[in-house]
Interface confidence: low
Amino acid sequence: MRTEAQVPALQPPEPGLEGAMGHRTLVLPWVLLTLCVTAGTPEVWVQVRMEATELSSFTIRCGFLGSGSISLVTVSWGGPNGAGGTTLAVLHPERGIRQWAPARQARWETQSSISLILEGSGASSPCANTTFCCKFASFPEGSWEACGSLPPSSDPGLSAPPTPAPILRADLAGILGVSGVLLFGCVYLLHLLRRHKHRPAPRLQPSRTSPQAPRARAWAPSQASQAALHVPYATINTSCRPATLDTAHPHGGPSWWASLPTHAAHRPQGPAAWASTPIPARGSFVSVENGLYAQAGERPPHTGPGLTLFPDPRGPRAMEGPLGVR
């Protein structure tokens, strides 16, 4: 029996509305407009499976639902990569695949999805509540990351009936279903806009979740403008860390991570702008990454009450901009 957890990675925020028009007339068109605008926004899905016959064997599958070309995929466990997570595998379309124990087999399934088999025994083996994260770097969307773990109820030792949910079916159903709804919605929206084109259009309230013009890193693919800041839906569960993570190292997470001020989420990317004030470049658990904020010191969009910002232990590497010539 396989148990699996499919994690929806992104949740588009709802822009506020302001204007003299009645809500009944406007809510649907503007919700549809939001859907149409964000329809092209990439998403990352993560699926974690555990084989009942091999309790220490996990299969992680990740996919990127976007139009851009993928330049790199990083799979980690124990939390987001660079935020307490341990790198398990790196898949590069041209350079190849690198994997680290207990990863046994990492491979590309399609041009936009990968799978990773973990095997371990004793200290190096994952356990049921380990969090697995996948980060996709793509052009022009930037970096997107989502995490997933087996739900507590998915203990393969339980005599629950098997749940062979075909991933292909789920993916296609989701893609086709959403695409169909969006297509219909967009057509309907155009219809409504044509009917109401003589009316004054309501102003969109400046949303606090709208990022400034993105600034790409010197070494990263430039990121296309995003309509909104998307926060992945994922639970960081590090209560079961690999026993090999015993010595003090950059991943040891101080308890004050959770109270990190939101303006510390990103680091300015100038050659020396961050020299005296180390702030993580990819510290936040936010899907859109490659340079969301126009200037250092600018307060980034409000990330919501449940979002924890994770400093990047790759201080040495995460923040360099043009200093590291690639």
């Epitope: 330049s71 790199l72 990083t74 980690s76 990569n81 660079g82 997570g85 341990t86 790198t87 790196v90 590069h92 350079r95 190849g96 695949i97 690198r98 994997q99 680290w100 124990a101 770097a137 070494w219 090999t244 993570l245 010595t247 003090a248 190292h249 950059p250 991943h251 040891g252 997470g253 101080p254 991570w257 990190l260 510390a264 020299a275 005296s276 180390p278 702030i279 993580p280 510290g283 400093p311 990047d312 232990p313 790759r314 201080g315 040495p316 590497r317 360099e320 200093l323 590291g324 690639r326």
Partner: antibody, heavy 127, light 112 residues
């Protein structure tokens, strides 16, 4: 246990190129992040560049940009460092270095953890 | 680049006695995650460098406990509680906070 064995000493003329090899044993090259560090006679250590596993690319110190190329042959688990347009000040011992897979680098997040070093390759640039 | 300055450049020591080497960086090496990105290496005569201490105060695998690292921000110290004959060589500090990582000039430890 990771072990690194480097190629033998080289004598080159100014303007020429040198290619130093570093053979990995104990692990496959694809599991490691290889760095190259050099040491001029009587001088200190100088990092030249290395592989960044997250970005899947090799990063070079700006000082060597355009002159150094670090490559890998995964079929033989051998890393190479080629330095072109040699000058007399490039006379040095060149080391490859990586992590032993039991340090923090093996867990991601710390790519300059170099606890396994090759024996060094002496490159002499002289006319 | 971050400039690393070591002192003293030469340190004559007595066997069995403690020794201390200082390393100062031009920029703080304390990262927001609470770790200091400073390593210590020892290069024994005629050998390749070997890692002693990483992230400021963590002994690398196989390193005797007579070696200890301390300090934070820009000032760091490597201490040898009781110097042994095999400890002679050149000690280097290295910052790993910024690309490129940079080394100090080295401190040569020799027996008096």
């Amino acid at each position: 246990e990771v072990q690194l064995v480097q190629s033998g000493a080289e004598v080159k003329k100014p303007g020429a190129s040198v290619k130093v090899s570093c053979k990995v044993s104990g692990y496959t090259l694809t599991e490691l992040s290889m760095h190259w560090v050099r040491q001029a006679p009587g001088k200190g250590l100088e990092w030249m560049g290395g592989f960044d596993p997250e970005d899947g690319e090799t990063i070079y110190a700006q000082k060597f940009q355009g002159r150094v190329t670090m490559t890998e042959d995964t079929s033989t688990d051998t890393a190479y460092m080629e330095l072109s347009s040699l000058r007399s000040e490039d006379t040095a011992v060149y080391y490859c270095a990586t992590d032993s897979r039991d340090g923090p680098a093996a867990r991601g997040g710390y790519y300059y953890y170099m606890d396994v070093w090759g024996q060094g390759t002496t490159v002499t640039v002289s006319s | 680049d971050v400039v690393m300055t070591q002192s003293p450049l030469s340190l004559p020591v007595t066997l069995g006695q403690p020794a201390s080497i200082s390393c100062r960086s031009s920029q703080s090496l304390l990262y927001i995650n609470g770790y200091n990105y400073l390593d210590w290496y020892l290069q024994k005569p005629g050998q390749s460098p070997q890692l002693l201490i990483y992230l400021g105060s963590n002994r690398a695998s196989g390193v005797p406990d007579r070696f200890s690292g301390s300090g934070s921000g820009t000032d760091f110290t490597l201490k040898i509680s009781r110097v042994e004959a095999e400890d002679v060589g050149v000690y280097y500090c290295m910052q790993a906070l910024q690309t490129p990582p940079t080394f100090g000039q080295g401190t040569k430890v020799e027996i008096k």
